[in-house]
């Protein structure tokens, strides 16, 4: 079937990075500068995307693939193919309909995007809170109270770095 198709349509032999040039007896011609074809058998090459203004080039255009853009620092891509740029927030915040807002008490976000997530509930695993949570960090769960009873052998973990104003419960 493939061979039959190629006999009928010489363009099917043109690989990615070329186009079937009707002006030259359907010879496979390389894509001109600033254009590409990502599949074979194409009759035209597509114009490369230009990452301008708020968009920066993440990946250069090649003869077989389009350029890829990302956003200027402090912002991240949104939409198909990075059609928009949305602001990053600080750690301890989330992006809402009213802009970047601090995480509510009992929640945290350790990244510059995404939503605030609830602190881990240590007691669900039968553990205790070793280090309190903050807006930027989850709580650190320690051994269960039973593990800390006299005579119980336990390996003492290294003291975690604590943020000012937060002491373990």
């Amino acid at each position: 079937f493939e061979r039959t198709r190629s006999l009928q349509d010489p363009c099917s032999n043109c690989p990615a990075g070329t186009f079937c040039d009707n002006n030259r007896n359907q010879i496979c011609s390389p894509c001109p500068p600033n254009s590409f074809s990502s599949a074979g058998g194409q009759r035209t090459c597509d114009i490369c995307r230009q990452c301008k203004g708020v968009f920066r080039t993440r990946k250069e255009c090649s003869s077989t693939s389009n350029a890829e853009c990302d956003c200027t620092p402090g912002f991240h891509c949104l939409g198909a193919g990075c059609s928009m740029c949305e602001q990053d927030c600080k750690q301890g915040q989330e992006l809402t309909k009213k802009g970047c807002k601090d995480c509510c008490f009992g929640t945290f976000n350790d990244q510059k995007r995404g939503i605030c997530r609830p602190w881990t509930n240590c007691s669900l695993d039968g553990k205790s809170v070793l280090v309190n949570g903050t807006k930027e960090r989850d709580v650190v769960c320690g051994p269960s109270p039973a593990d800390l009873s006299p005579g119980a052998s336990s390996v003492t973990p290294p003291a975690p770095a604590r943020e000012p104003g937060h002491s373990p419960q």
Partner: nanobody, 119 residues
Framework: QVQLQESGGGLVQAGGSLRLSCAAS????????MGWFRQASGKERELVAA???????YYEDSVKGRFTISRDNAKNTMYLQMNSLKPEDTAVYYC?????????????WGQGTQVTVSS
């Protein structure tokens, strides 16, 4: 309802300086992206500079090194310091604010202030 009011525009000689202000009322905009746009006669409105809530800034290529955007969240105000002005900077300058986007249509717009740079 959020209102944005620009001030500081005017007529200035090429090479001179102006400082535009954009005062917001009706809501604290500390978490918003704020931007300065301009529209020259017969041309499309373009984004000149923007600043995120965290202080990240963006400048259009033609104003880099000459314009500086800043914000004072305590005063709910944004500024655009324009130095080494050129005749091609002549336009109506608008301030805008959006909770999320650097690109696209901003939620809130000011009425604009005219900047004219004479040669």
């Amino acid at each position: 309802q959020v209102q944005l009011q620009e001030s500081g525009g005017g007529l200035v000689q090429a090479g001179g300086s102006l400082r535009l202000s954009c005062a917001a009322s009706g809501r604290t905009l500390s978490g918003y992206v704020m931007g300065w746009f301009r529209q020259a006669s017969g041309k499309e409105r373009e984004l000149v500079a923007a600043i995120s809530s965290g202080g990240s800034t963006y400048y259009e290529d033609s104003v880099k090194g000459r314009f500086t955007i800043s914000r004072d969240n305590a005063k709910n105000t944004m500024y655009l310091q324009m130095n080494s002005l050129k005749p091609e900077d002549t336009a109506v300058y608008y301030c805008a604010a959006d909770p999320r986007r650097l690109t696209g249509l901003y939620d809130y717009w000011g009425q604009g202030t005219q900047v004219t740079v004479s040669s």
